[in-house]
Amino acid sequence: LEVQVPEDPVVALVGTDATLCCSFSPEPGFSLAQLNLIWQLTDTKQLVHSFAEGQDQGSAYANRTALFPDLLAQGNASLRLQRVRVADEGSFTCFVSIRDFGSAAVSLQVAAPYSKPSMTLEPNKDLRPGDTVTITCSSYRGYPEAEVFWQDGQGVPLTGNVTTSQMANEQGLFDVHSVLRVVLGANGTYSCLVRNPVLQQDAHGSVTITGQPMTFP
């Protein structure tokens, strides 16, 4: 029995619903009484949802899963996962048994966009050319972990004296804090870019230092 799932991971935003597609080709005369369907976590073998003896056996996974009962007879064994969480990320295996048996695994990739970075400066007054300042770029509640890039006003990458740390909250979402230590020129703009590698989403923040006063666009 051939079981088909998408090759590419299913990308779902945290808090949204995701459909993990799985299909099989029923033979003529197929009835749901013959169908055994099991969805489980690929690595741990934890049961997620099942269908047997002509009946939906329900969710074994936090009551957030559902099948598409009206479409099962046509060979649609897809699973709906509601209110996606970071912890849901991973591989799910769809097992289908009628007379024959088949299985395939589909990957769920969870993502959450990062907030627009907030920029802070230390020290933040009485600055002169030649002073060393610490610029902190903070962006919140994204997933997966971010890449952070710094550049100056001319677009030249700044890679030295950068320290980036990640903090995961109880929901598994990351707060990212990146610190740039730089010696001030006469004036200058310093930008940070926080990139979500899954969503290919870039969040930008910048600070312009023009002697006095400073501006935070």
Epitope: S107, Q109, Y143, E147, Q166, A168, G172
Partner: antibody, heavy 121, light 108 residues
């Protein structure tokens, strides 16, 4: 069963290089962040480096190895690597490969048996 | 960098006794703390994650508690196989991921 098997350790002189490998099996390797943790003889545990999952290759290092060590992974071979350059006597340790429990929770739920690296003149 | 301080450094107890190990963080780590057991010549083994959740296959005589900066690992009744070194580890703010210095539980 999850298995992590390190290899590549040995005795080298200060300033030399070594490449450690960790062969993983029993789980979907590409779906998990992976780490190297070391333990000097008679000492405690020290995290060395982490690489995130999939092919994003976002890497982190302890200050003590930054600029000298490079972590990488080959998801097609289910293998994690640690390239160690400019080795110092203080790098002498058992190096463990460790799997992150999830991609945002970096506890280490599975460890290899370790491979010993000795840096001595 | 978050520093984890474990106490005591050594704990001498008899089989059947209760062991309480402490781990203090230099700043809050929420509940993002793990405990590991290491026996001589072996790799560490995860016991507890999320401050209080037992890892797969870990006996229920091991329990973790605490949040913020103060954590404890309790072994309700020590078995001969429990004599080992125990480490705590935070994964709240990284890099670096940091470990405590360890507590050695030895037979009295």
């Amino acid at each position: 069963d999850v298995q992590l098997v390190e290899s590549g350790g040995g005795v080298v002189r200060p300033g030399e290089s070594l490449r450690l490998s960790c062969a993983a099996s029993g789980f979907t390797f590409s779906n998990y962040a992976m780490n190297w943790v070391r333990q000097a003889p008679g000492e405690g545990l020290e995290w060395v480096s982490r690489i995130n999952y999939k092919g994003y290759n976002i890497t982190y290092y302890a200050d003590s190895v930054k600029g000298r060590f490079t972590i990488s992974r080959d998801n097609s071979k289910n293998t994690l690597y640690l390239q160690m350059n400019s080795l110092r006597a203080e790098d002498t340790a058992v190096y463990y490969c460790a799997k992150s429990g999830s991609n945002s929770n970096n506890f280490f739920d599975y460890w290899g048996l370790g491979t010993l690296v000795t840096v001595s003149s | 960098e978050i520093v984890l301080t474990q106490s005591p450094g050594n704990l001498s107890l008899s089989p059947g006794e209760r062991a309480t190990l402490s781990c203090r963080a230099s700043q809050s780590v929420g509940s993002q703390l793990g405990w590991y057991q290491q026996k001589p010549g072996q790799a560490p083994r995860l016991l507890i994650y999320g401050a209080s959740t037992r890892a797969t296959g870990i006996p229920d005589r091991f329990s973790g508690s605490g949040s913020g900066t103060e954590f404890a690992l309790t072994i309700s009744s020590l078995q001969s196989e429990d004599f080992a070194v125990y480490y705590c580890q935070q994964y709240y703010d990284w890099p670096p991921l940091t470990f405590g210095g360890g507590t050695k539980v030895e037979i009295k």
